[in-house]
Interface confidence: medium
Amino acid sequence: FERTRSLQDPCSNCPAGTFCDNNRNQICSPCPPNSFSSAGGQRTCDICRQCKGVFRTRKECSSTSNAECDCTPGFHCLGAGCSMCEQDCKQGQELTKKGCKDCCFGTFNDQKRGICRPWTNCSLDGKSVLVNGTKERDVVCGPSPADLSPGASSVTPPAPAREPGHSPQ
């Protein structure tokens, strides 16, 4: 089937970066400036994306691939292919309709994006709070209160839980 189609359809021979020009006897013509075709056999070239305003050009458009955008400093990408830019906040804040607002007591955000999340409840795991939480950091849970009582067997206490959102260094 593919062989038959290629014999009947001269456009299938046009490579990426060109289009099949019906105005010129279906000759493969290069994509005009500021356009591209990422696959062969196309009858038109697509207009290149322009990274304007809050968008910055991360990768220039070529005849075979679209431009790629990211966001200007102070903003981060949202959506497939960075379709939108959202403003950063400071750690310890979240973005609301009223702009960047501090995390409420009992919540934290250790990133410049996303929402404030509740501190870990250490007691749910039978542990105690080793380090108090802040707006920027989760609490650190330590050994259970029973492990700290006098006469408890001397076992090595477990390592503090890793803070959410952080990968090991």
């Epitope: 939108m84 403003q87 609301t96 309709k97």
Partner: nanobody
Framework: EVQLVESGGGLVQPGGSLRLSCAAS????????MIWYRQAPGEELEWVAN????????YYVDSVKGRFTISRDNATNSLFLQMNSLRAEDTAVYYC????????????????WGQGTTVTVSS
């Protein structure tokens, strides 16, 4: 083509007033939140104010509260920023931007921007 075009900038003395306009075309203006941003020389973009689809919700950065007023006219697809009691620190390029169509999923992103209009406050 989706487009935003700002106008109304200029040179004004401290304490003076300006009214910025933003003309929208190519999309259903009344479906979207709209936002004003500004960028002072050598600084990052700063959010100034935003307004919801029907104009019933308006929010401002602290530094302009009581001096700036954001408004919109959905009949003419226009966004406005009335700036009173201007200060030297308000000097910047002001941009209007299209926000979300409901701010769903905590996304406060912008996808369409104007070319900006320059406001200079100087004596």
């Amino acid at each position: 083509e989706v487009q935003l075009v700002e106008s109304g900038g200029g040179l004004v003395q401290p304490g003076g007033s300006l009214r910025l306009s933003c003309a929208a075309s190519g999309f259903t203006f009344s479906d979207y939140w709209m936002i004003w941003y500004r960028q002072a020389p050598g600084e990052e973009l700063e959010w100034v104010a935003n307004i919801n689809q029907d104009g019933s919700e308006k929010y401002y950065v602290d530094s302009v509260k009581g001096r700036f007023t954001i408004s919109r006219d959905n009949a003419t697809n226009s966004l406005f920023l009335q700036m009173n009691s201007l200060r030297a620190e308000d000097t910047a390029v002001y941009y209007c931007a299209r926000g979300g169509d409901g701010y769903s999923n905590s996304h406060y992103g912008m996808d369409v921007w104007g070319q900006g209009t320059t406001v200079t406050v100087s004596s």
